[in-house]
Interface confidence: low
Amino acid sequence: MALNSGSPPGIGPCYENHGYQSEHICPPRPPVAPNGYNLYPAQYYPSPVPQYAPRITTQASTSVIHTHPKSSGALCTSKSKKSLCLALALGTVLTGAAVAAVLLWRFWDSNCSTSEMECGSSGTCISSSLWCDGVAHCPNGEDENRCVRLYGQSFILQVYSSQRKAWYPVCQDDWSESYGRAACKDMGYKNNFYSSQGIPDQSGATSFMKLNVSSGNVDLYKKLYHSDSCSSRMVVSLRCIECGVRSVKRQSR
Amino acid sequence: IVGGLNASPGDWPWQVSLHVQGVHVCGGSIITPEWIVTAAHCVEEPLSSPRYWTAFAGILRQSLMFYGSRHQVEKVISHPNYDSKTKNNDIALMKLQTPLAFNDLVKPVCLPNPGMMLDLDQECWISGWGATYEKGKTSDVLNAAMVPLIEPSKCNSKYIYNNLITPAMICAGFLQGSVDSCQGDSGGPLVTLKNGIWWLIGDTSWGSGCAKALRPGVYGNVTVFTDWIYQQMRANS
């Protein structure tokens, strides 16, 4: 099997674990069912539904795979929890009753066309060009609060351009820590901010989002405009929280 | 965790133990001082109410858990598209009533960013207080083990999970068995080290038995959910 067929030279066998970006560093492999790791968040894609019974021991030589959720069954050991366990057990039995001998697949189609975006789980569709355009169109305003993101393992700050319907890195020119704090807040980090720094752009980006410092006191991404140049040739690397680090173990001598 | 090793203090500082009425039920991962990622199937009815849940951080042994950092849960947010039959979109968030104080033993893990490159057999780690063998009891001590990712096309082959794996799931483990997450590990982390940083790639979800040949562990594909996680953090701050 040629694992390496989709990889650029020097990267080796790899796949991009897609969240919701549409850029491919490793081009997608031929589709399988389901198609690898999807480009969109869970609420955006069809959901195949096989029928099976959780928490039933696998019987050898059967074609139905019985699966076990990996939460603890210890809850049912205490006598004071009998009613809770009864409810849990009843749920399991009812689920078990739904087992079909053959796995049944059903595909739900997204309501939205390819030129539209879905408003979270509400099912409303809006044109991609209205996404992050400064006006809320979704019932819960999702189209205006998912306009910044961090990209890749270097935490590159990217902003969505509604005109170009694509994500672009933010140029370091005129950037300051206060904007970093605002971006973190936009993402959902209430009181968290760790670091904001310029790092050399290694993606070979030819387009950027730049700060218009003269714009008034408006939302961060409304201060940003599309530009084909970035004089510092540095992009913003933003970390909202110091995460993913373990303490260095100090050996006693 | 089947086939794992006992964890040392500070090894997995984002790991929390989620208790119901004094009993460990699921694991979870710290992502901010107030937010824990866990599995949606952990908080299904009748356990959907936050009042049932307490989170413990910074302690390795269940028998010593009450000496640890103890936090009541304020909100439980299950993924709106979670399917209890298929375990699709098996992710949930817990907001704590009081923020965690970070130290050497209590720290957050990084949420994965879109565009991260993972090797086809990227080495990942699982951790938890789950059973150390199939149908076993919860472990007193936190265990951890290395498991490689299994590419979705392979995991969906008819010899393994025969198309049960959706894009919202990620498989990890050894196809011959022997190392796996197990009952009681649910909701806990599947992490990988990249660029010197530990990333939350998955949340422990399901599997057919534990550590069986051709039945690797299945995890919620956290990369797919980062957008939803940020949305919830924004909406509930």
Partner: antibody, heavy 121, light 111 residues
Framework: QVQLQQPGAELAKPGASVKLSCKAS????????MHWVKQRPGQGLEWIGL????????NYNEKFKSKATLTVDKSSRTAYMQLSSLTSEDSAVYYC??????????????WGTGTTVTVSS | DIVLTQSPASLAVSLGQRATISCRAS??????????MHWYQQKPGQPPKLLIY???NLESGVPVRFSGSGSGTDFTLNIHPVEEEDAATYYC?????????FGAGTKLELK
């Protein structure tokens, strides 16, 4: 070609320890799990344990948990098994064998040449 | 652990005849269309050699006179026609789960 090379014999005293080696060549060392199997004279085969060379987190047959310790050195492509607190019961031929976890079928397609351990005072 | 019972413990067969060795598992070693049973040949002073994998698949380089069959709990190794070089001990082994276990072995002698 694919080979697992083991020393022919090891002599040890009761109560002592012995460390057996198994040097792999001709294939990607980290792509296969290494297993160890015991065979007493005139007896059958007994599985001791396994070690995935890329992680080092070994798995043991319950019977050998306090007897054997498995390790690997990726740089020299060598797997090791240390046997401790030796008794005459440990006198046997010990084989390393590779198991392709990628194919997942779990058969031993290549065996080491075997090391004869003799425990004698 | 899954226990494998081999029979007979030994058998003597004339050149050119058929040798049949049986292996019974204490529980099924078949799942998802595969039977995780394998057969090895061992000659004195040598390591075991893989003959048959997944119940019926001939390992490359092994003569076609060796064949395997069975599923679930009952498996058979056939050698036909038996040749002089086939005098050896034969073991079955399962890999359905850990620990993998071996049968006690069947010693094949030539009459």
């Amino acid at each position: 070609q694919v080979q697992l090379q083991q020393p022919g014999a090891e002599l040890a005293k009761p109560g002592a320890s012995v460390k057996l080696s198994c040097k792999a060549s001709g294939y990607t060392f980290t792509s296969y799990w290494m297993h160890w199997v015991k065979q007493r004279p005139g007896q059958g085969l007994e599985w001791i344990g396994l070690i995935p060379p890329n992680s080092g987190s070994s798995n043991y047959n319950e019977k050998f948990k306090s007897k054997a310790t498995l390790t690997v050195d990726k740089s020299s492509r060598t797997a090791y098994m240390q046997l401790s607190s030796l008794t005459s019961e440990d006198s046997a031929v010990y084989y390393c064998a590779r198991w392709d976890y990628g194919s997942s079928y779990g058969y031993f397609d290549v065996w080491g040449t075997g090391t004869t351990v003799t425990v004698s005072s | 652990d899954i226990v494998l019972t081999q029979s007979p413990a030994s058998l003597a067969v004339s050149l050119g005849q058929r040798a049949t060795i049986s292996c019974r598992a204490s529980e099924s070693v078949s799942t998802s269309g595969y039977s995780y049973m394998h057969w090895y040949q061992q000659k004195p002073g040598q390591p075991p050699k893989l003959l048959i994998y997944l119940a019926s698949n001939l390992e490359s380089g092994v003569p076609v006179r060796f064949s395997g069959s069975g599923s679930g709990t009952d498996f058979t190794l056939n050698i036909h026609p038996v040749e002089e070089e086939d005098a050896a001990t034969y073991y079955c082994q399962h890999s359905r789960e850990l620990p993998p276990t071996f049968g006690a072995g069947t010693k094949l002698e030539l009459k």
